[in-house]
C-alpha cells in the first residue's frame, strides 16, 4: 500500500496536512494555511491512548465496588484506570466490568490452577492414585497414603473423593 | 504570484493513455498538496485524487483507482496525472489545484477528448 | 461518500441585488465547506474556504456562513462580473465531493 497523502502523526483536513494531538491531549481546532493543529490537555479523570483528532477525550473507567472491582492501576491523560477483583473473586471478561466469587473444586477434583483476579479457578478430576475430599478453591489432589512405607496394608482402597484406609498386617501365628 | 500551468488539449483514441502535466510556481512546491479534478462535459466537477510532493504521498477517489495515477517532479515543481485505458467516457476537462484550506489555486484545466 | 447538493440550480437576480446560494450536506461536515467561481474560459477561484474564511484577493460582498450539515453563500450586492456558476465544496471526509453548481445568470 502506497503512503497517503499525509505523513505519520497528520491529518487531511480540507486539502491540508494537519499534526494529529499527542495521547493525552484533544483537538480543538483544525490547522489552516495560516495556524497549527490546536490541541488542549485532557482534564481530570479523562484521557486520549493515541495520536488522535478526537475533539472529546474518553472518560477514565470506574471501578465500582458494588460489582467486586479495586482499582489495579490508576488511569492517567494517556492511559485508562485499570480494575481487577476483589481478593477471592475473578473478572467476568477480559474488559472486567464486573467480578464473580472464584469456582471451588468439588470432591474428586482438585485444582490445577489457582484463580488470579482475570482467571476462574481450572479443575481437574483426581487421577488414580490421588484424591481430595473438601471442596476448595485452593487445595490440589493429594496422593493416597502409602501404607507400604508405614509397614501397614491397604485395608480399604482410595477412591477419587477418599484415601486409602491402612490397618496392621496380619501376624503369622 | 501563484500559477498552476497545465499541459495542452489531447486528443486520445479508446485503450490509449495520457499524461497531463501541472507547473507551479509562485510558492514552495513541496509545501502543499495538489489536487485533481474532472469535468466532463456541461457537468459538475468530481475529485480524482492528492498528491503531497514532498514525498509522493497519495490518496485517490474509489472511483479513479487503477485508472488514475499520481505523481509529481519536485526538481521542476510539476505534477503529473496519468490516465490508463482510456475510454469516451473519460472525455473532460482535468483540473490541477493548490491545496491549503480548501482548493485555493486552480490551474486553466486540460480538455482530454477520446475519440476513435 | 458525503453527498452536497446544493439549491437553486439557476439563480436569477438583477445587478445590485442581494443574491442567497445554498449547499446541504449529507452528513455534518464540521465548516470544512469551500465555495468556489467559475467563468466560461477563466480558471476556477476560490471564494470562500472553512465556511467563512475569505480567499485574497476576493471583495467583501462575498461572504459565508452555516454550520453542521447547512451552509450559505451570500452575494451581498451584485456586480456584473458575479454571475458565473458556483460550486460548493466539502473538505471534511474523503472523497472530497462538490455540489451539483448554481448558475447565477442575470435577471
Known amino acids: 500500500e502506497p503512503p497517503t497523502a499525509c505523513r505519520e502523526k497528520q491529518y487531511l483536513i480540507n486539502s491540508q496536512c494537519c499534526s494529529l494531538c499527542q495521547p493525552g491531549q484533544k483537538l480543538v481546532s483544525d490547522c489552516t494555511e495560516f495556524t497549527e493543529t490546536e490541541c488542549l490537555p485532557c482534564g481530570e479523570s479523562e484521557f486520549l491512548d493515541t495520536w488522535n483528532r478526537e475533539t472529546h477525550c474518553h472518560q477514565h473507567k470506574y471501578c465500582d465496588p458494588n460489582l467486586g472491582l479495586r482499582v489495579q492501576q490508576k488511569g492517567t491523560s494517556e492511559t485508562d484506570t485499570i480494575c481487577t477483583c476483589e481478593e477471592g473473586w475473578h473478572c467476568t471478561s477480559e474488559a472486567c466490568e464486573s467480578c464473580v466469587l472464584h469456582r471451588s473444586c468439588s470432591p474428586g477434583f482438585g485444582v490445577k490452577q489457582i484463580a488470579t483476579g482475570v482467571s476462574d479457578t481450572i479443575c481437574e478430576p483426581c487421577p488414580v492414585g490421588f484424591f481430595s475430599n473438601v471442596s476448595s478453591a485452593f487445595e490440589k489432589c493429594h496422593p493416597w497414603t502409602s501404607c507400604e512405607t508405614k509397614d501397614l496394608v491397604v485395608q480399604q482402597a482410595g477412591t477419587n473423593k477418599t484415601d486409602v484406609v491402612c490397618g496392621p498386617q496380619d501376624r503369622l501365628r | 504570484e501563484v500559477q498552476l500551468v497545465q499541459s495542452g488539449a489531447e486528443v486520445k483514441k479508446p485503450g490509449e493513455s495520457v499524461k497531463i502535466s501541472c507547473k507551479a510556481s509562485?510558492?514552495?512546491?513541496?509545501?502543499?498538496?495538489i489536487e485533481w479534478v474532472r469535468q466532463m462535459p456541461g457537468k459538475g466537477l468530481e475529485w480524482i485524487g492528492v498528491?503531497?510532493?514532498?514525498?509522493?504521498?497519495?490518496n485517490y477517489n474509489e472511483k479513479f483507482k487503477g485508472q488514475a495515477t499520481l505523481s509529481a517532479d519536485k526538481s521542476i515543481s510539476t505534477a503529473y496525472l496519468q490516465l490508463s485505458s482510456l475510454k469516451a467516457s473519460d472525455t473532460a476537462v482535468y483540473f490541477c489545484?493548490?491545496?491549503?484550506?480548501?482548493?485555493?489555486?486552480w490551474g486553466q484545466g486540460t480538455l482530454v477528448t477520446v475519440s476513435s | 461518500e458525503i453527498v452536497m447538493t446544493q439549491s437553486p440550480a439557476t439563480l436569477s437576480v438583477s445587478p445590485g441585488e442581494r443574491a442567497t446560494l445554498s449547499c446541504r450536506a449529507s452528513?455534518?461536515?464540521?465548516?470544512?465547506l469551500n465555495w468556489y467561481q467559475q467563468k466560461p474560459g477563466q480558471a476556477v477561484r476560490l471564494l470562500i474556504s472553512?465556511?467563512?474564511r475569505l480567499h485574497s484577493g476576493i471583495p467583501a460582498r462575498f461572504s459565508g456562513s452555516g454550520s453542521g450539515t447547512e451552509y450559505t453563500l451570500t452575494i451581498s450586492s451584485l456586480q456584473s462580473e458575479d454571475f458565473a456558476v458556483y460550486f460548493c465544496?466539502?473538505?471534511?471526509?474523503?472523497?472530497?465531493?462538490f455540489g451539483q453548481g448554481t448558475k447565477v445568470e442575470i435577471k
Open positions: 465544496q466539502q473538505g471534511n471526509t474523503l472523497p472530497w465531493t
Open positions: 472553512s465556511t467563512s
Open positions: 498528491i503531497n510532493p514532498g514525498y509522493g504521498g497519495v
Open positions: 489545484a493548490r491545496g491549503g484550506s480548501g482548493f485555493a489555486f
Open positions: 509562485g510558492y514552495g512546491f513541496t509545501n502543499y498538496l
Open positions: 452528513q455534518d461536515i464540521s465548516n470544512h
